[in-house]
């Protein structure tokens, strides 16, 4: 073999051992009767050599690197040639490398002729063995843009400051053209832009730079998708990690030509948009990472382009004929901004009247169907009113607050089911008794069930939110003075499986003056956290609430408050707390606007905690959090 490299060609040829094989006999490059395992040929050199074996392709690889300097002179733009021609090279696995160095202000664009490129992930290989490895540069740091095979959608890659393109050809491959050209562009002001062109239906899997390692800190990378107008594109994230941000927030942004809401900003953990018509851009923006513990940002995603879905002809029956004072609304879930580019998602009544919102009322049987590619874009909100106008008729009457099975069988997620419970003023009150004891949601012990009950006053002038409650706690019942709304709110699709855990009975009971009374029967196993209504906004003025806390005979209860002082400042009146032993009626009274809150106290018998508010000055509200823990009694002190 003879390889002659023209002077000033800036080409270096390197023949070296490839990955070691288990072949018995080694092979050498023979030059001037010397046996070597590596041969480097520089511009202006002419070297004659042979191999010491019959099949050097099993032993050696050849790298041909051309350095293109766009810093000191004009750049040789246009179609890139394979130099030296593959016919002049020994038949080894070949890697042609083009290393282009340019100023930061210069954009470089690699244009790939058909077939376009398909990105592959770590551990994957190309069927024909032809791979394209592309990397960029940020100052002195090399950044891997990705490894690509033929027969894909990637048509152009734009970078700045420099690009390194490596084309790997197996020894048996007849290819004798590079398949790409280089053009200059204005600065792209980001790490890179990858253009992906879909001619018809198909999918593309793409990855952030350096994948599976971390995306460079505080960088921006953009993918431009060219999609025929009659097709729809959906994005799904296959794999992602977030780094630890010190400043800014990692995010993806969608830009849709013609949209009035550009850019659409999403967190990586959000559900990404689907059913987009026409072209769109997706950008990944990094953040300033924590120097001590940066973590890594990485993203692997898929774009699926297909014809709009053939909508299901399935009819769903919603029978509300036996219901009273109830309305069911199917509507789009709120999105951060309305995305006008997303095709409509409709719900139809009797398959004729279709709209994005539909409200069904009680007293009838309804037939509905859906014209929507993704039913998770919709949810249901239901309101039902249970009212008592005649206190003589209602007293002691009970109603079950349960989601009807017809509603649970719909293919749309239930968001809220609200019961408005109305009583005659100053005549009756309400008691809520759950099928399973409830836990109050607190920061210290959050609910992690698929649904919760939100209990709030339903009197328009009163801003009183009792709290969020979920099954699996110690609250046996909640008594409230007057009108309330109880909302069953779902937090996960698994509510369908957990629906059997719901179950709340409301009864009308004789009127009492306190705003609310919670009956608590703690379990010996866990700490019960309780907090005053209207947490964060403060207990309303002149409002009184009580907790009736049961202590079993063989247990002792520890009552603990979570701050030293209540923090309330009274404008008028006094705020106080009474802790009263139910057996002896012995009580302790604490002035909440003056005294420190009591230290942890032990109670051997059931007791009351009553908190009554004054009219506080603004900003100095009454918020109390306390816990009750049962432990076995060691000594009987009675």
């Amino acid at each position: 073999f003879e390889i002659a490299l023209p002077r000033e060609s800036n080409i270096t040829v390197l023949i070296k051992l490839g990955t070691p094989t288990l072949l018995a006999k080694p092979c050498y490059i023979v030059i001037s009767k010397r046996h070597i395992t590596m041969l480097s040929i520089k511009s202006g050199e002419r070297i004659v050599f042979t191999f010491s074996c019959q099949s050097p392709e099993n032993h050696f690889v050849i790298e041909i690197q051309k350095n293109i300097d766009c810093m000191s002179g004009p750049c040789p733009f246009g179609e890139v040639q394979l130099q030296p021609s593959t016919s002049l090279l020994p038949t080894l696995n070949r890697t042609f490398i083009w290393d282009v160095k340019a100023h930061k202000s210069i954009g470089l664009e690699l244009q790939f002729s058909i077939p376009r490129l398909r990105q592959i992930g770590p551990g994957e290989s190309c069927p024909d063995g032809v791979t394209h490895s592309i990397s960029g540069r940020i100052d002195a740091t090399v950044v891997r843009i990705g490894t690509f095979c033929s027969n894909g959608t990637v048509s152009r890659i734009k970078m700045q400051e420099g690009v390194k393109m490596a084309l790997h050809l197996p020894w048996f491959h007849p290819r004798n053209v590079s398949g790409f050209s280089i053009a200059n562009r204005s600065s792209i002001k980001r790490l890179c832009i990858i253009e992906s062109v879909f001619e018809g239906e198909g999918s593309a899997t793409l990855m952030s730079a350096n994948y599976p390692e971390g995306f460079p800190e505080d960088e921006l990378m953009t993918w431009q998708f060219v999609v025929p107008a009659h097709l729809r594109a959906s994005v799904s994230f296959l794999n992602f990690n977030l780094s630890n941000c010190e400043r800014k927030e990692e995010r993806v942004e969608y830009y849709i030509p013609g949209s009035t809401t550009n850019p659409e900003v999403f967190k990586l953990e959000d559900k990404q948009p689907g059913n987009m018509a026409g072209n769109f851009n997706l950008s990944l923006q990094g953040c300033d990472q924590d120097a001590q513990s940066p973590g890594i940002l990485r993203l692997q995603f898929q774009v699926l382009v297909q014809h709009p879905q053939n909508e299901s002809n399935k009819i769903y029956v919603v029978d509300l004929s036996n219901e009273r004072a109830m309305s069911l609304t199917i509507e789009p879930r709120p999105v951060k901004q309305s995305r006008k580019f997303v095709p409509g998602c409709f719900v139809c009544l009797e398959s004729r009247t279709c709209s994005s919102n539909l409200t069904l009322t009680s007293g009838s049987k309804h037939k509905i169907s859906f014209l929507c590619d993704d039913l998770t874009r919709l949810w249901m909100n239901v309101e039902k009113t249970i009212s008592c106008t005649d206190h003589r008729y209602c007293q002691r009457k009970s109603y079950s607050l349960q989601v009807p099975s017809d509603i649970l069988h719909l293919p749309v997620e239930l968001h809220d089911f609200s019961w408005k419970l109305l009583v005659p003023k100053d005549r009756l009150s309400l008691v809520l008794v759950p099928a399973q004891k409830l836990q109050q949601h607190t920061h210290e012990k959050p609910c992690n069930t698929s649904f919760s009950y939100l209990v709030a006053s339903a009197i328009p002038s009163q801003d009183l939110y009792f709290g969020s409650f979920c099954p699996g706690g110690s609250i046996k019942q909640i008594q409230v003075k007057q009108n309330i709304s109880v909302t069953l709110r779902t937090f996960a699709p698994s509510f369908q499986q957990e629906a059997s855990r719901q179950g709340l009975t409301v009864s009308f009971i004789p009127y009492f003056k306190e705003e609310g009374v919670f009956t608590v029967t703690p379990d010996t196993k866990s700490k019960v956290y309780l907090r005053t209504p209207n947490w964060d906004r403060g207990l309303p003025s002149l409002t009184s609430v009580s907790w009736n806390i049961s202590v079993p005979r063989d247990q002792v209860a520890c009552l603990t408050f979570f701050k030293e002082r209540s923090g309330v400042v009274c404008q008028t009146g006094r705020a106080f707390m009474i802790i009263q032993e139910q057996r002896t009626r012995a009580e302790e009274i604490f002035s909440l606007d003056e005294d420190v809150l009591p230290k942890p106290s032990f109670h051997h018998h059931s007791f009351w905690v009553n908190i009554s508010n004054c009219s506080p000055t603004s900003g100095k509200q009454l918020d109390l959090l306390f816990s009750v823990t049962l432990t076995p009694r060691t000594v009987d002190l009675t």
């Epitope: 080694p26 050498y28 030059i31 009767k33 010397r34 046996h35 070597i36 395992t37 041969l39 010491s52």
Partner: antibody, heavy 117, light 111 residues
């Protein structure tokens, strides 16, 4: 298994000549250099020269041009070194060394040449 | 001629410690991307034994305690950790240019 078998010890008079042999086996004799190295007692290694049996190409260090003549017989896979005009300073152990790439991994056991009147 | 200067001429190293031998060439022994420098071990009464070829490649059967490094004019043989059996004289040889030449040798003694 590769072997280089050198001829036995030689006792020669000053001014005489000796021809040392080195028979190779276990590798392709014609494809690799055979080098010859001199080592005087308690001294270091001194390169004499090398021959490429495939085409008879020879290389010598200046000091041994005219003193040593390297030849090879392809048919018997044997390399020879003739030392002429022997003097007492030619008394030494002479090694042949060969290889099957990439370098001289195989050495003969050495031939002791003693020049004495 | 390319002159190879080995240093030190002799050295004593404790068992388990590292031994480093240097070989400096009067001009570069690199070409075609290779360093044509090789290392041998010789024990009394025996022919030399190849340890390292082309500056850094370990000959088959030689323990990984031996390593070679360097390029152009400066080369190093390292033995780490040294064992009792390593007591010998070590030589470098170049074949980049005719005549091929040897270094003067370094005698390694184990303490």
């Amino acid at each position: 298994e590769v072997q280089l078998q050198e001829s036995g010890a030689e006792l020669a008079r000053p001014g005489a000549s000796v021809k040392l042999s080195c028979k190779a086996s276990g590798y392709t004799f014609t494809s690799y250099w055979m080098q010859w190295v001199k080592q005087r007692p308690g001294q270091g290694l001194e390169w004499i020269g090398a021959i490429y049996p495939g085409d008879g190409d020879t290389r010598y260090t200046q000091k041994f041009k005219g003193k040593a003549t390297l030849t090879a017989d392809k048919s018997s896979s044997t390399a020879y070194m003739q030392l002429s005009s022997l003097a007492s300073e030619d008394s030494a152990v002479y090694y042949c060394a060969g290889y099957d790439a990439p370098w001289f991994a195989y050495w003969g056991q050495g031939t002791l040449v003693t020049v004495s009147s | 001629n390319i002159v190879l200067t080995q240093s030190p001429a002799s050295l004593a190293v404790s068992l388990g410690q590292r031994a480093t031998i240097s070989c400096r060439a009067s001009e570069s022994v690199d070409s075609y991307g290779n360093s044509f420098m090789h290392w041998y071990q010789q024990k009394p009464g025996q022919p030399p034994k190849l340890l390292i070829y082309l500056a850094s490649n370990l000959e088959s059967g030689v323990p990984a305690r031996f390593s070679g490094s360097g390029s152009r004019t400066d080369f190093t043989l390292t033995i780490d950790p040294v064992e009792a059996d390593d007591a010998a004289t070590y030589y470098c040889q170049q074949n980049n240019e005719d005549p091929w030449t040897f270094g003067g040798g370094t005698k390694l003694e184990i303490k």
